[in-house]
């Protein structure tokens, strides 16, 4: 059967003016799964995001991560999309002072 | 085995408006793209838009006014409409399944194509 | 939009030989490429992904290369079957793009 993923979004300072904001995607089984950023709704490209490798974490299930560069302030323009064994989900960016968002997906 | 086929309505005058039904089966629209791309006669593919698992819908900027992509999950069923067709959107049009693990994205399965051509 | 050319539109090849198919890309895509093939009654099929990567299926024979904006498709032993055009793809940036395409015939 399929285990569905933990998804865990961060953010961390860039440089002056722009944050870095990570999915990730952890404890899923199997290991095709898609998570990609969406600004206002609409992918972003290949080019502007960058991804970890979709690797084993040591208990049969799998983690990856995506991460994209953003302008401080518009994080409510960004969400993180993940479809994984025929679900998907919609993840934000937490506000300045939650550095973390949990979801569990059955 | 996953197979996707589109059906049109082959011909379609000018001006009027453009819609093709992409029939899938061996996976689930809840959890997986699906992309149309068109080829007209004699030239190469160009991507004209997708819809993912989510409903959320990705456009070819330089149709996307014209573009509209939709589908029904529980009939398994991806639309695509088009508005005010030209004799230049002549083409073979088909859906095919996206892929996107990653750095990687391709198109994996194929539809045969259906013909559409814009005359009066 | 990123352009996607293929120089050689069309090429003649005999059974056996090894056949090397261009694309050159307006600017670096980073190795988001995908190769597919067309036969002559228009079927579609993923022939490689991501610059070097072979889906199941597809026969050993086929391999691609390339980094930044030049890329290829190689076909080690020409077959039969092999008798199609080829088309390079990008999705570096959106919206993806193709490129004109590579029709390869027997001599």
């Known amino acids: 059967g399929s285990v569905p993923p933990m998804v865990n979004v961060t953010r961390s300072e860039a440089s002056e003016g722009n944050i870095t904001v990570t999915c990730r995607a952890s404890s899923f089984y199997p290991r095709n799964i898609t998570l990609t950023w969406r600004q206002d709704g609409v992918s972003l490209s290949h080019d502007t995001q960058q991804w970890g490798d979709v690797l084993p974490d040591g208990n049969g299930t799998y983690q990856t991560w995506v991460a994209t560069r953003i302008c401080q302030g518009e994080e409510q323009r960004f969400t993180c999309y993940m479809e994984h064994s025929g679900n998907h989900s919609t993840h934000p960016v937490p506000s300045g002072n939650s550095h973390h968002h949990h979801h569990h997906h059955h | 085995q996953v197979q996707l086929k589109e059906s049109g309505p082959g011909l379609v005058a000018p001006s009027q408006s453009l819609s093709i039904t992409c029939t899938v089966s061996?996976?689930?629209?809840?959890?997986?793209?699906v992309n149309w791309v068109r080829q007209p006669p004699g030239k190469g593919l160009e991507w004209l838009g997708m819809i993912w698992g989510d409903g959320s819908t990705d456009y070819n900027s330089a149709l996307k006014s014209r573009l509209s992509i939709s589908k029904d999950n529980s009939r398994s069923q991806v639309f695509l409409k088009m508005n005010s067709l030209q004799t230049d959107d002549t083409a073979r049009y088909y859906c095919a399944r996206g892929a996107h693990y990653g750095k990687r994205w391709y198109f994996d399965v194929w539809g045969a194509g259906t013909t559409v051509t814009v005359s009066s | 939009d990123i352009q996607m050319t293929q120089t050689t539109s069309s090429l003649s090849a005999s059974l056996g030989d090894r056949v090397t198919i261009s694309c050159s890309a307006s600017q670096n895509i980073n190795n988001y490429l995908n190769w597919y093939q067309q036969k002559p009654h228009g079927t579609v099929k993923l022939l490689i992904y991501?610059?070097?990567s072979l889906p199941s299926g597809v026969p050993s024979r086929f391999s691609g290369s390339g980094s930044g904006t030049d890329y290829s498709l190689t076909i080690s032993n020409l077959e039969p079957e092999d008798i199609a055009s080829y088309y390079c793809q990008q999705y570096s940036k959106l919206p993806p793009t193709f490129g004109g395409g590579t029709k390869v015939e027997i001599k």
């Open positions: 061996g996976f689930s629209l809840n959890g997986q793209g």
């Open positions: 991501y610059t070097s």
